[in-house]
């Protein structure tokens, strides 16, 4: 376990071999989750890229947060996708939080502390627990089958995950840098493995 506070993973160039694998202590399927993270890239007006990829053996797109060029954020649960459009692209560090719950199917998507309109996806579904969680690449099969054209070039950090939906107040607290206690992925006590050309550097966002 490593305390990654105020650090970020840096992916300096496009590749299909560089990634970070995160280890999560999940023992039972997820009926809800929240993922929050920071990232910083110049790619957004050039091509799509993977932000957070959670695959199971049953479903390679179990949870996927992806930037789709000319559209915005693509969010997938259990292979089913919804989009959150971004009309204008700026190059700056971005903080996102996204949550989903099985009971209602409701998805929340927050960008820099501001909520997008709620949408619905995969009501009644459960997310598999035995997962391969990858930063820097999009998994087309469990733990692999990467394409360089979908890789992240830039920085990613403050990756935290909960097995429940955070309240708006809690998400605001996280965005503002207040205290929180993630129970699936914890950036302050991170179990991870680096493959390829990935560097750990001080974070560039506040």
């Amino acid at each position: 376990q490593t305390d990654m506070s105020r650090k970020a993973f840096v992916f300096p160039k496009e590749s299909d071999t560089s990634y970070v694998s995160l280890k999560a202590p999940l023992t039972k399927p997820l009926k809800a989750f929240t993922v929050c993270l920071h990232f910083y890239t110049e790619l957004s007006s050039t091509r799509g890229y993977s932000i957070f990829s959670y695959a199971t053996k049953r479903q390679d797109n179990e949870i996927l947060i992806f930037w789709s060029k000319d559209i915005g954020y693509s969010f997938t649960v259990g292979g089913s996708e919804i989009l959150f459009e971004v009309p204008e692209v700026t190059v700056a560090p971005v903080h996102i939080c996204t949550s989903w719950e099985s009971a209602s199917g409701i998805v929340e998507f927050w960008v820099d502390g501001k909520p997008r309109v709620r949408k619905s996806l995969k009501k009644g579904y459960t997310v598999g627990a035995e997962a391969s969680i990858i930063l820097g690449q999009e998994q087309d099969s469990f733990g692999g089958n990467f394409e360089g054209s979908q890789s992240l070039v830039g920085d990613i950090g403050n990756v935290n995950m909960w097995d429940f939906v955070l309240s708006p107040d809690e998400i605001n607290t996280i965005y503002l840098g207040g205290p929180f206690s993630p129970n699936v992925l914890n950036w302050r006590a991170l179990k991870y493995e680096v493959q390829g050309e990935v560097f750990t550097k001080p974070q560039l966002w506040p």
Epitope: N61, S68, T76, G79, S80, E81, I82, S120, L121
Partner: nanobody
Framework: EVQLQQSGPELVKPGASVRMSCKAS????????IHWVKQSHGESLEWIGF????????YYYKNFRGKATLTLNKSSSTAYMDLRSLTSEDSGVYYC??????????WGQGTILTVSS
């Protein structure tokens, strides 16, 4: 075996509308979005939009807003695309595909649309 079976070729006059279909089999229809894609002669693929069979939600790419309408019939596992106010520019091969904007794993065989007077 997953299959997407599309309807046959269409020859229509300018100004008319057309409906094409995409019948899915071999998987649970509501588990995956159905995308529609256009290929004009010698051109690259153009993404039209997609529909979520689970809840009926649709998304249209900018160039096809007002041109295409996506619907479905859950009981027959069939997705439909209506195209309106057709011109010769709309001629091409239209494909349905299963998946996401990131990856599409199964494709229909295509429906040829010819718009001509």
């Amino acid at each position: 075996e997953v299959q997407l079976q599309q309807s046959g070729p269409e020859l229509v006059k300018p100004g008319a509308s057309v409906r094409m279909s995409c019948k899915a089999s071999g998987y649970t229809f509501t588990d995956y979005n159905i995308h529609w894609v256009k290929q004009s002669h010698g051109e690259s693929l153009e993404w039209i939009g997609f529909i979520n069979p689970d809840n009926g939600d649709t998304y249209y790419y900018k160039n096809f807003r007002g041109k295409a309408t996506l619907t479905l019939n859950k009981s027959s596992s069939t997705a439909y695309m209506d195209l309106r106010s057709l011109t010769s520019e709309d001629s091409g091969v239209y494909y349905c595909a299963r998946g996401t904007t990131v990856e599409k794993d199964y494709w229909g065989q295509g429906t040829i649309l010819t718009v001509s007077s």
